[in-house]
Interface confidence: medium
Amino acid sequence: IIPVEEENPDFWNRQAAEALGAAKKLQPAQTAAKNLIIFLGDGMGVSTVTAARILKGQKKDKLGPETFLAMDRFPYVALSKTYSVDKHVPDSGATATAYLCGVKGNFQTIGLSAAARFNQCNTTRGNEVISVMNRAKKAGKSVGVVTTTRVQHASPAGAYAHTVNRNWYSDADVPASARQEGCQDIATQLISNMDIDVILGGGRKYMFPMGTPDPEYPDDYSQGGTRLDGKNLVQEWLAKHQGARYVWNRTELLQASLDPSVTHLMGLFEPGDMKYEIHRDSTLDPSLMEMTEAALLLLSRNPRGFFLFVEGGRIDHGHHESRAYRALTETIMFDDAIERAGQLTSEEDTLSLVTADHSHVFSFGGYPLRGSSIFGLAPGKARDRKAYTVLLYGNGPGYVLKDGARPDVTESESGSPEYRQQSAVPLDGETHAGEDVAVFARGPQAHLVHGVQEQTFIAHVMAFAACLEPYTACDLAPRAGTTD
Amino acid sequence: IIPVEEENPDFWNRQAAEALGAAKKLQPAQTAAKNLIIFLGDGMGVSTVTAARILKGQKKDKLGPETFLAMDRFPYVALSKTYSVDKHVPDSGATATAYLCGVKGNFQTIGLSAAARFNQCNTTRGNEVISVMNRAKKAGKSVGVVTTTRVQHASPAGAYAHTVNRNWYSDADVPASARQEGCQDIATQLISNMDIDVILGGGRKYMFPMGTPDPEYPDDYSQGGTRLDGKNLVQEWLAKHQGARYVWNRTELLQASLDPSVTHLMGLFEPGDMKYEIHRDSTLDPSLMEMTEAALLLLSRNPRGFFLFVEGGRIDHGHHESRAYRALTETIMFDDAIERAGQLTSEEDTLSLVTADHSHVFSFGGYPLRGSSIFGLAPGKARDRKAYTVLLYGNGPGYVLKDGARPDVTESESGSPEYRQQSAVPLDGETHAGEDVAVFARGPQAHLVHGVQEQTFIAHVMAFAACLEPYTACDLAPRAGTTD
């Protein structure tokens, strides 16, 4: 498909001249950021961004790649080096420590320097590193965590927890020996390490005692409370704040977000991770966009500003399953949340960053025609005389041999939301990838986001932009009209 | 491997604070660029950049990812959308038209708008678009093309040629009907379309009549001249300029580059593409770094400045073979050329851009330990109880079934320069990938390189920075001390 207007050189020359004009107008703001938002696309490497752009464009009846994601509109871009101290290819725990605390850690640890060792409880104490969210709170800002995973998951936990094992969601997941040594589960740390104003995502079951039925799935014992210590962490959290509200469904969330008496809001919408966007029951569970909007409504009441972490956490899960349909539809919802946040905030006073913790071994090749489905087949056949998809994985569960050979695939099969793209190597779960990821930035001090940087730089830019520790002597003018 | 110094949070905090300090000091230059250099890593997607960084670091006895490529030091980064008008995943012809001429074209066409159709000679005339190199020449600058492929290959051809078929290297490749319609081969266009001061790379055989023995392989008929028109294009080119010199080996190149009487230099060091760096005979063939240095020595004599195109063109070829060793060692030599150019030029007056035309379906995953070989195995086994490499391809010739199963691999096999990494789909040649690629920028007007842009933006930034057509009214101050 060749769009007629694109055949004319004037189309491209005019478009580029406009882009140049916009680039020339870019003026680095010399003011401090009142608000900080970090949007984290878990597993959202550059190949995921491009494929999602095409899909989002095609959902709007465009050819695809010429369209813009919300994140594409951010004026500044850098590349972020994601390796952990001990691994070339990292996990979401070590990376969360990097972009939220400004220090690199070891694989599967969270909120700890690399002096801590995975699963060794006695290496925790003294190696804690403090997140930018925690520092924002100490500076009088309101703070929030929003995710499509469980709120105790590796990425959001980087904002508040310190643990040698990212899998210690509730005390039932922590070995007795580690509990005796004083190592706390992540759910406990969620409510006790610091005061978080807004907590939205999944993860109900880690907050309640074993045997507590889940409100949404009361007959499903496996979805009920998991805690061995008998604690009801939601109750404990509610008791801490007079204006605290706990909600577990969309209707309650929308009500609470508009209620001026609510100062603290915890919404846990699934026992574990939230459902994929394509499986979400829109009457019961809010979308990531809706959770983001609710968080911003509450947090923006604080005249001193806020810090908000928003995670599209299941992009990663779709990729691990080698189900690109899930990964890409999650990415689009993540981008929709970015777009909505942009409408609800001002780039005059809000530094917004979009990045990924790491990438995936996910590729988009095969020379497909413009406008063809991102989930479709490449033109021509492979060397085994069978069709193949444009989307493929280096490794993962999509590897199948049928009668000792690679299976053929049709356009209708490859377009199914359940289809697993093929891979070179058979694994139960497709792996992360180690290449640099993009950082998109907009707002005060966004111009500092440049070049190729360590992932830790992200936390430092946020801290500096808002004059938080260790950059309280940041020498930035407060935005005109800022209240304190 | 955990470096002791990296266990200390101070290491990361100090490093990030320094990076912030450098970011704060960045001052967009308001001057015009006297010189333009575009470094094109053919097929150098972000996954290739990261893997090459690690390899280059490890060759210097470092762990790898913490080190810097020369391109990593460039202060500004953007993402470039590489699709062609007719394909989601492009080729090197359409992309060359974009980043060198500022207009997107169709797959496998060069220097033509998308109104031209692949292989249809009669759609050429009237659809030609003019490269920035051509515009630089018209403005009185010296211009050069340096590549490790044949100089008539798609990427360099974007700087001087207009053709509906990128494969028309010599007239022997052009169908008789197209020749009769007046369509010229690329080699002819190389010497006749415009005056190029420096031409360095491979591609001897396309310049000489059929039956002309090659100077390096005189007994190998298949490497001799291919032309049917009986023309000796080198002779024709030499006759155009009093100070013109033709060389075909490294010794002659080094002599010519230091000879003040040489005003124009053509060096063709192989009949076709140049050898891979790991196979290069260092007495006969120059490296990309040496060719770049030679070009800069000649071009920088012009007080009005220069335009130089430098291509690491065989990164792409290594990937097409699914031989990551070749792709990554080519990337390192490309980066070495960037480094050398940086030493020979000043960022006060030279805008340098580094980018790729497109990516490849190449991934780096599997959670390898820090410091482990980039060509090594992932920890653990795959679901078929066999080892697997951290580097893999989505598709390509590395797909093999042995006794109806995926072959096992050892560390010594995977470390071999000949090893083909496995792929999900068997193809004769691994394909390009469609995700955005990075653009790195340094020098006057480099700050305009920002955000997510169409690939065409690159040509426009260069033209604007040097006040070339259509931006002659660029309103930029000439650099202090610039002579005319």
Partner: antibody, heavy 123, light 106 residues
């Protein structure tokens, strides 16, 4: 002109060792992959070992039948290729050739060969 | 490791005959096959590389073809000086020779 001259062959008893040499000239020795190939009496050609060039760190590869017994090495200052053969067996009796790869053709085909040196393993 | 199966092991033909020798690889070798001529007491001589490219000085009656796993050496019109043993060599993955084909004149 590329020249390869093997030496060091002769009669040796089973279980003993022998070192073959191949002196190279006419090309930049460090830039090329070098191999040893043999031909046993009445048998076909058998590739034995490879040592890569400077750019690839002079890494080595062997065929299964000689792995652990034979070692390929090179003295780049003298442009000499070696094959150290230990624990020799009667079936190692053959003419041993050294060969240089050519990269021009995008592969590593054995383009240049020496004349060979005869090794006889017998008690 | 890649195995090469060469056939026939010996071949008797008359001067002027068209002669075909085949090599089958155990896996796809991506056209990385060479053919050598070997005469007793001499070093093997490279005749064809990359499936079909003739070495300098090799008569044009020799040709090579094939792809994937199957490859062929053809002599279009056998000459007395062509009497020798011919070996194929895969060089896609290290090196493996075929068993050889001994060519004789009837």
């Amino acid at each position: 002109e590329v020249q390869l001259v093997e030496s060091g062959g002769g009669l040796v008893q089973p279980g003993r060792s022998l070192r073959l040499s191949c002196t190279a000239s006419g090309f930049t020795f460090t830039d090329y992959y070098m191999s040893w190939v043999r031909q046993a009496p009445g048998k076909g050609l058998e590739w034995l070992a490879l040592i890569r060039n400077k750019a690839t760190g002079y890494t080595t590869e062997y065929t299964a039948s000689v792995k652990g017994r034979f070692t390929i090495s090179r003295d780049n200052s003298k442009s000499i290729l070696y094959l150290q053969m230990n624990s020799l067996k009667t079936e190692d009796t053959a003419v041993y050739y050294c060969a240089r790869a050519s990269f021009y053709y995008d592969g590593k085909v054995l383009a240049y060969w020496g004349q060979g040196t005869l090794v006889t393993v017998s008690s | 490791d890649t195995q090469m199966t060469q056939s026939p092991s010996s071949l008797s033909a008359s001067v002027g005959d068209r002669v075909t020798i085949t090599c089958k690889a155990s896996q796809d070798i991506n056209k990385y096959i060479a053919w050598f001529q070997y005469k007793t007491g001499k070093a093997p001589k490279l005749f064809i590389h990359y499936t079909s490219t003739l070495q300098p000085g090799v008569p044009s009656r020799f040709s090579g073809s094939g792809s994937g796993r199957d490859y062929t050496l053809t002599i279009s019109s056998l000459q007395p000086e062509d009497i020798a043993t011919y070996y194929c060599l895969q060089y896609d993955n290290l090196y493996t020779f075929g068993q050889g084909t001994k060519l004789e004149i009837k």
